[in-house]
């Protein structure tokens, strides 16, 4: 197994209606035409995967059914939203990326992506 | 020029296992996902699964998980769909696809399950 | 799953009509792709990614759409569009196709 960089943006806000994006880039030391893609979410120590995709040379990302991720790949990016987000699913999001095919096998694990998701205030009713 | 070559027609009974290869040519073997969609007579199109060539990663369609097993052989550039207990429902002309984009397509071959 | 719903299923028009065909997905997708089928002929790849034209298709089909909602047109119908369309997304497992649009000649 051998070690490969791969970049995300520190932070990330949820928009109002719960979706967060954001880029995750990979440093490929060869051309590697299978890739895994995986997101972990880390809080309170502990790390639970939140997604997982495997995608060869186009550029939509596939992912099992109800899960809350979509993504798009752009040469060595991945392109990710996580969608159906919580006040209660704050938390780092971790891109792990996987070469897997041609040998050799390449992991490389990002630092993080801190998301923020802040829960909409309900309307206030109205007496009018 | 991309081409994919399949086996041909086959006549099976009911509860038999069926073999349908797909032989490619003219592009990277290992650079695409191959794909297998089924079309019963008159109906429309079914996703079955895939495969990825180099590593051998599989997805199947939940439908078919336990009957459907898909294979390569890299020395040949060949993909290979089994469909095992077969029904008269799965009477059918299966195609290889290959690409995240079914760009090109095998010229099908005719499954007829009859007792 | 995904459910993909075409409409119409069928579809009569005459050579020089400008037709659409509507695809309907159960739940957001981020593309969707379209494919022409003529009778005992493999299907063939008409539109990925909602708008791109696959190599060699004429610039009368055009897609368009997001979300849950996507469109394919044909601006000026030719003899030899007359088939099967079928829509087709793969933002999920399992990739799932619509029941197909036949259009046929009026």
């Known amino acids: 197994c051998k070690a490969m960089h791969v970049a995300q943006p520190a932070v990330v806000l949820a928009s109002s209606r719960g979706i967060a994006s954001f880029v995750c880039e990979y440093a490929s030391p060869g051309k590697a035409t299978e890739v895994r893609v995986t997101v972990l979410r880390q809080a309170d120590s502990q790390v639970t995967e939140v997604c997982a995709a495997t995608y060869m040379m186009g550029n939509e990302l596939t992912f099992l059914d109800d899960s809350i991720c979509t993504g798009t790949s752009s040469g060595n990016q991945v392109n990710l939203t996580i969608q159906g987000l919580r006040a209660m699913d704050t938390g780092l999001y971790i891109c792990k990326v996987e070469l897997m095919y041609p040998p050799p096998y390449y992991l490389g694990i990002g630092n993080g992506t801190q998301i923020y998701v802040i829960d909409p205030e309900p309307c206030p009713d109205s007496d009018f | 020029q991309v081409q994919l070559v399949q086996s041909g027609a086959e006549v099976k009974k009911p509860g038999a296992s069926v073999k349908v290869s797909c032989k490619a040519s003219?592009?990277?073997?290992?650079?695409?996902?191959i794909n297998w969609v089924r079309q019963a007579p008159g109906q429309g199109l079914e996703w079955m699964g895939r495969?990825?060539?180099?590593?051998?990663?599989?997805y199947y369609n939940e439908m078919f998980t336990g009957r459907v097993t898909m294979t390569r052989d890299t020395s040949t550039s060949t993909v290979y769909m089994e469909l095992s207990s077969l029904r008269s429902e799965d009477t059918a002309v299966y195609y290889c696809?290959?690409?995240?984009?079914?760009?090109?397509w095998g010229q099908g071959t005719m499954v007829t399950v009859s007792s | 799953d995904i459910q993909l719903t075409q409409s119409p299923s069928f579809l009569s028009a005459s050579v020089g009509d400008r037709v659409t065909i509507t695809c309907s997905a159960s739940?957001?997708?981020?593309?969707i792709h379209w494919y022409q089928q003529k009778p005992g002929k493999a299907p063939k790849l008409l539109i990925y990614?909602?708008?791109t034209l696959a190599s060699g298709v004429p610039s009368r089909f055009s897609g368009s759409g997001s979300g849950t909602e996507f469109t394919l047109t044909i601006s000026s119908l030719q003899p030899e569009d007359f088939a099967t369309y079928y829509c087709?997304?793969?933002?999920?497992?399992?990739?799932?196709f619509g029941q197909g649009t036949k259009l046929e000649i009026k």
């Open positions: 696809a290959i690409g995240d984009y079914f760009d090109y």
């Open positions: 003219g592009y990277t073997f290992t650079s695409y996902w």
């Open positions: 495969i990825a060539p180099g590593s051998g990663t599989t």
């Open positions: 739940k957001s997708v981020s593309y």
């Open positions: 990614d909602t708008s």
């Open positions: 087709q997304q793969r933002t999920t497992y399992p990739l799932t």
